[in-house]
Structure formats: C-alpha cells, structure tokens
C-alpha cells in the first residue's frame, strides 16, 4: 500500500532560526521516510531537508536551517513519502516569508506612570534582537488589574523608525497595580511572538473618589439619646488601591448649622448619639491629594412617618448565587439599600451592606456567605435623601441536618397520657429552616409510634398510651437536608390518677 | 559540482560476493536519499536498490531483496552496496544516483558474473 | 509492477524536424512521478524531464514533455545533431520504479 498522501502543510519562518513544516499525517503505520523539497531564491536554487537523521524529533515536521534561509523570500514546499511500496507527494505550497515571520518576544523594561499624568500608565519595551531591522511591527499589549483574572488587550504598531518603543495606556484606575506583557510580529505576518516577561506598574495616586454612605439606627436611650451606627465605604468602581488617610464627619439638626459637630477618624464605622430632631450627616475621605465628593445622609426625626413601598420579596437560590428579589408599589425608587448580616444569638459579628440602582433584585456570590448560617437580609427604599421602611426576609446559602436535636421532657404524666415539651434549637445549631418536628416514643419491647408536627409546635399531648408503661421518647427535628434526634427520654404511665402527683424523669 | 564516482566492479563467480562503493562531494550527502540503479548488457536500465538520507530507511525490488544490502557512511560521504549469491542475470553496469527523482548518476561501475 | 513501453524503440529524424517519442504505461503514473532521462553512447544517464513537464537543468527549451495516466510523450521541436542520443522514460511512483526500454534516436 502506498502511503498516505501528506496534507495540511504548515510551515513557519523562525527569523535567523529555521523554517520550518509540518504536515499530517503525523504517523505513519508503515515504514514510511519523509523528504520535503524546497525550492527558494524565488525558485533559482533548490534543496530538500528529510525527516530520517541523528535527532529523530517528530516525525511529520522538518526544518531548513541557515545559511540558506534567505529573507525575504517566496518558497516552495512539497512533501514526499515513501515506504516500500512506493511514493506520494503532496500537492506544492506556496510561503512568503514575511507572511509566516514568527520573532522572539519583546522585553518591557519598565511600566510606570508619567508624573502629572493621570490614570495612566507609560510601557517602555526593547524591540527584540532577532527581528528584521526594516520591518514595521505590529503588537498586542496585555494588561490586568493584579487581582484580577481576565486580561484586556490593545494593538498597536511600530514603525522602524520609531526608535523609541514606548506606548502610553490610557483610561485606566488611579492608584492601582496593573500586570503588563507584550508581543509583537512583523505586520504582514500571520504568526505572533510569544508573550513578554510580565512587568507590574502602579498608576498615579488621586484625591479619593467618593464614598457610600450608611447607618443602623438603634433605639433611643433612657435619656432620649439615640445611638446611630455610621459606617461608609469605597463607592462602587472606586479605584481598587485608592488609599484613604483619614475621614471627616460633621452633623448637625436640621436647620441649625451653628450646632454642627466634626468628628476625625481613620476607621469606616462611627457611632454618633443624636437627639430626637432630623440630623443631616456629612462624610469625606481625605489624602495626600485632596479630599473626596461629600458623602450625605439623612437621619429621620425620631417621630417621623416613613414611606413603605416594598410589598414582597423572594429569596432564591441559583447553582452558585443567591437572588433576592422585591416588588414594590412606588415606581419612582429606583435606589435601594440592601443589608445583611448572620442571625445569631449574640451581637452580629458581621455586617454588611450595598447600595442597589435601577433594579429590583440583587445578587450575592454564594461563596461570600457562610454555609448552614442563616441569614437576615433587610432591603430599604431610598427616594432622594429619604429612607423608607425596610422589608426583611431569611435566607440559608445552604442547609444542612441540625446540629443538636430538640431537648425534651415529659410533663403531666397521666395513666394514658403525656404532654410533651421541647425548646427551640438555638440558632447557631439549626443549620437551617426547621419545617417539623417528630416525635418518635415506643412501649418497652413495644413497636415504635411517631408524630409529626408543624415548626411552631413546642409541645404536644401523647394519648391512648398504656397504664403503668415504661416509655421512651425522643424529638426529632428537620430541615430540609434532613433531621437530628433530641436526647432520648424515659418516663411511666400512672396506674391511677394522681392530680398532684410529681413525676422525675430521666433526660 | 556534483560527482558520483562508482568503484568496486569485477569478475565474480556465481553464487560470489562484492561490495560496490560510491564516493560522493559537491553537495550535502547526508540530506538525501540514495540510489543504486544498473544496466544489462541489452542497455536496459533497472532500479536496484535506494537508502534513505539517514540510513534508516532502506528499499528494495523483489528481484535482489535478500541477496543485496545497501548502507551509507555520511561521515565518509560514502555509499555502499554488499552483494552476495550473484547470479549471472546480475550482470551490469552499477551506477549510483543521488535522488529526488535519480537527478545526479555516477559514471558506473562494471560487474561480471560469469563462470 | 508498471510496465513502461516505449514507442518507437529506435526512430531517425533530419536537422530541423518536429520528433515525439511515446511512454505507455500498463497502469496508471501520477504525471508528477514520470521522468525522462537522456543517454549517450559511453556515458551514464543524465535527467532530462522531471514531473512530465519541467526541464531539468541545462536542457534546451526546444525540449518539451507532456502527458498523464498511461500516456505520456517527449518532443523535440527542431532536431538538432547533439539530440541524438538514446532517451529512457521512468516511473518514481510504485515500487518497483520501473524504466522503459528506450528509445534511440539518430540523425537521418
């Protein structure tokens, strides 16, 4: 059988390396030798290059190697292969070299941002060696945030003369660590170099950008003092390294300034304590550089009526986020904050919060949120510089079966039946929604009954039991993923009636 | 320039060995395939035997396969060729080519096989 | 194994004359594996046509070939004296490569 017929012939000018082709197919089953010819000099010289030598690399490729590379040029490539029963050629390709030029890779040398020059950032590269002198180049820049994964990109070219290889990238974030990394190639060439080193640049530093701004309003003290938690942040597309040296706060009751009061601080939180009045709240952030735009807020009067407009929300979960979603009755609120922090016990260690524009919904990664913790989620209306009622709901991430089951005890035994009675499973241990309950109790050497109650149930009548019975009992309670029993419980049934008989269990 | 200079011919007696040998310059021999092709006393021409440019490849009609090996030194620029359980039809004039097809032949050498 | 027959094995032609000479082969030769070669008496073959068409180096262009399948023809368009001389045709395509048997031409 003859061979196959070599196809997909792909050839590439290593410039002052090799030129090299490949061609498929890559393995041939029998004894098969490869010979590619080559003519050059624009077809006046001719000579081959054969797969069969000393370093046998692979064996559907072959290289031309100085000094008979001429450039530029315009070559032609046949393949042939022969086993023992003969020969195939392929059909003649046609290369211009400086359509399939593949150079090294350019070396930036320095990435830094010009002095008074704003969000940008001036890459200076050496042209590489191996690279035709007269040529003009084309090159693609890369450049990303440090932190992040996806890269941008923006082409350029370069002519010969253009001695000075350097390009300025413009549009982008004050104070912030780009990663940059080039190539180039020859501009009528299909093959691009590798890419560059990286090299990291910072951009010039500003004045802050602007903050957004919250409070939690607590309830009035004993003297009338109310505490209001302040708490500010970055506003969203803040550059990502701009960097605050301070914050300043200043208040005062409506319609009286000559009352205001300043706070410094250098952290993001800040409790003030205001009277029952409306109070307006100014925040700035402040560097080396200047100040940020004003932050302002306005805290209701004590009394005052706010708006509600929020009449249902769902919370919903995706494969790996979390959609709150509300309807609301005032089409013209299209601001919304949303607040959410871990339904614990105790004080919520954490607390966060964002601000919602002309949408209706919001969405959180499920991966920032613990599993198996349940949360509070609040959304607030904010029309202009007022805040209406909130509308809360409850969310798990992720549910799981509780961590402690029900404990449990047995109440006014009787000679037929028992009421019994369970606590709530504290909130750090419920590892989700509790839909019900069960009660499972068997009769010594007796078969097992059970009954299942709604999750507001926290104590259930047991009847039709057996006088004088040794019973054990226990309570289990269910999520979603599934149920933990309580401790177990052993009690008797009566043989008579006792009105005012006390009964110890065991737990 | 290309040259091919054959040597090696002689009067051998049936069922005899010999080895032909082929000096080549002027071009780089370990880049291409080799060829042995002879001619019969009647001018008629016939391939013999072709090696490739590395040596690892070698290729032979039916009528010598088994009787003849064709090898190559390409740090002496040498072609060879072992024959052995001559018969008198291997009678001819032995020229080696240079190939891609045969484009370059040697003057030849001439090999008798006769009792 | 192709079998090449020449035709016609020996032929004379005078100064000036248009000649052709024939290949037949018994299966079909891709045209890119058909080669013609040019003998004279006391000397060792030379390529004269490569791939049925292309002329090898040196050749005059007075020479030309064409052909495909199992047919194939060289063509001198005017005889010169030094043409004369014994042209063998050869396949490079299925092993065994095979060479025709000739054919002669001399001056008339």
């Known amino acids: 059988v003859l061979p196959a017929k070599p196809e997909n012939i792909s050839c590439i000018f290593y410039y002052e390396e090799n030129f090299t082709c490949t061609w498929s197919p890559e393995k041939e089953a029998s004894y098969t030798w490869y010979k590619v010819k080559r003519t050059y000099s624009y077809g006046y010289k001719s000579d081959i290059c054969s797969t069969d030598n000393s370093t046998r690399g692979n064996h559907a490729s072959c290289s031309f190697l100085p000094p008979t590379i001429t450039n530029p040029d315009n070559y032609t490539i046949q393949v042939e292969a022969q086993n023992a029963d003969g020969i195939m050629k392929s059909d003649i390709t046609y290369w211009n070299l400086d359509a399939i030029m593949k150079i090294e890779p350019p070396e930036i040398f320095s990435v830094k941002s010009v002095l008074g020059i704003k969000r940008m950032l001036q890459i200076k590269w050496i042209r590489p060696v191996l690279a035709p002198h007269s040529s003009t180049l084309k090159y693609t820049l890369r450049f990303r945030t440090i932190n992040s994964a996806y890269w941008m990109e923006v082409n350029f070219t370069k002519e010969d003369i253009d001695r000075d290889e350097t390009y300025n990238l413009t549009e982008l974030q004050a104070f912030t660590e780009y990663v940059m990394t080039l190539r180039c190639a020859p501009a009528e060439s299909m093959f691009w170099s590798g890419w560059s080193q990286e090299k990291v640049g910072t951009t010039e530093e500003e004045a802050p950008y602007g903050l957004d701004l919250w409070r939690v309003l607590k309830p009035a003290m004993v003297d009338g003092r109310r505490p209001v938690q302040l708490m500010w942040k970055k506003a969203t597309g803040a550059p990502v390294l701009e960097k605050a040296l301070g914050y300043n706060i200043w208040y005062f009751p409506e319609n009286n300034t000559n009352l205001t009061e300043t706070v410094n601080t250098t952290n993001q939180t800040h409790e003030l304590y205001l009277g029952g009045k409306t109070y307006w709240v100014y925040v700035v952030s402040y560097n080396s550089l200047g100040e940020s735009p004003v932050a302002t807020l306005r805290i209701p009067a004590l009394n005052e009526k706010t708006f509600q407009c929020i009449e249902a929300m769902q919370a919903c979960l995706t494969q790996d986020q979390l959609v709150v979603e509300w309807q609301s009755s005032a089409p013209e609120v299209d601001t919304w904050m949303v607040e959410w922090f871990p339904d614990v016990d105790s004080e919520p260690s954490s607390f966060s919060w964002e601000s919602v524009s002309q949408a209706r919904n919001w969405t959180i990664q499920k991966d920032e949120l613990k599993p198996l913790w349940c949360y509070n989620i609040s959304v607030y209306p904010v029309l202009r510089d007022r805040v209406g009622q909130p509308y809360s709901t409850q969310a798990y991430v992720q549910e799981g079966i509780p961590s402690a089951g029900p404990v449990t005890q047995a109440d006014s035994i009787g000679v037929k039946t028992v009421t019994i009675t369970w606590k709530e499973i504290p909130k750090s241990k419920r590892n989700g929604f509790i839909k019900n309950y069960t009660i499972f109790y068997q009769a010594e050497d007796g078969k097992e009954f059970s009954k299942t109650v709604n999750s507001n149930i926290l104590q259930y009548r047991l009847e039709s039991l057996t006088r004088r019975t040794s019973y054990s009992l226990q309570v289990m309670a269910s999520t979603n993923a599934g149920g933990t029993n309580g401790t177990k419980i052993n009690f008797k049934t009566l043989s008579i009636s006792h009105h005012h008989h006390h009964h110890h269990h065991h737990h | 320039e290309v040259q091919l200079v054959e040597s090696g011919g002689d009067l051998v007696k049936p069922g005899g060995s010999l080895k032909l040998s082929c000096a080549a310059s002027?071009?780089?021999?370990?880049?291409?395939?080799m060829s042995w092709v002879r001619q019969t006393p009647d001018k008629r021409l016939e391939w013999v035997a072709t090696?490739?440019?590395?040596?690892?490849?070698?290729y032979y009609p039916d009528s010598v396969k088994g009787r003849f090996t064709i090898s190559r030194d390409n740090a002496k620029n040498t072609l060879y060729m072992q024959m052995s359980s001559l018969k008198s039809e291997d009678t001819a004039m032995y020229y080696c080519?240079?190939?891609?097809?045969?484009?370059?032949w040697g003057q030849g050498t001439s090999v008798t096989v006769s009792s | 194994q192709i079998v090449l027959t020449q035709s016609p094995a020996i032929m004379s032609a005078s100064l000036g004359e248009r000649v052709t000479m024939t290949c037949t082969a018994s299966s079909s030769v891709g045209s890119s594996y058909l080669h013609w070669y040019q003998q004279k008496p006391g000397s060792s073959p030379k390529l004269w046509i490569y791939?049925?068409?292309n002329l090898a180096s040196g050749v005059p262009v007075r020479f030309s070939g064409s052909g495909s399948g199992t047919s194939y023809s060289l063509t001198i368009s005017s005889m010169e004296a030094e043409d004369a001389a014994t042209y063998y045709c050869h396949q490079y395509h299925r092993s065994p490569y095979t060479f025709g048997g000739g054919t002669k031409l001399e001056i008339k």
């Open positions: 090696i490739s440019n590395g040596g690892s490849y070698t």
């Open positions: 080519a240079r190939n891609e097809p045969p484009d370059y």
């Open positions: 791939d049925t068409s």
């Open positions: 002027g071009f780089t021999f370990s880049s291409y395939g």
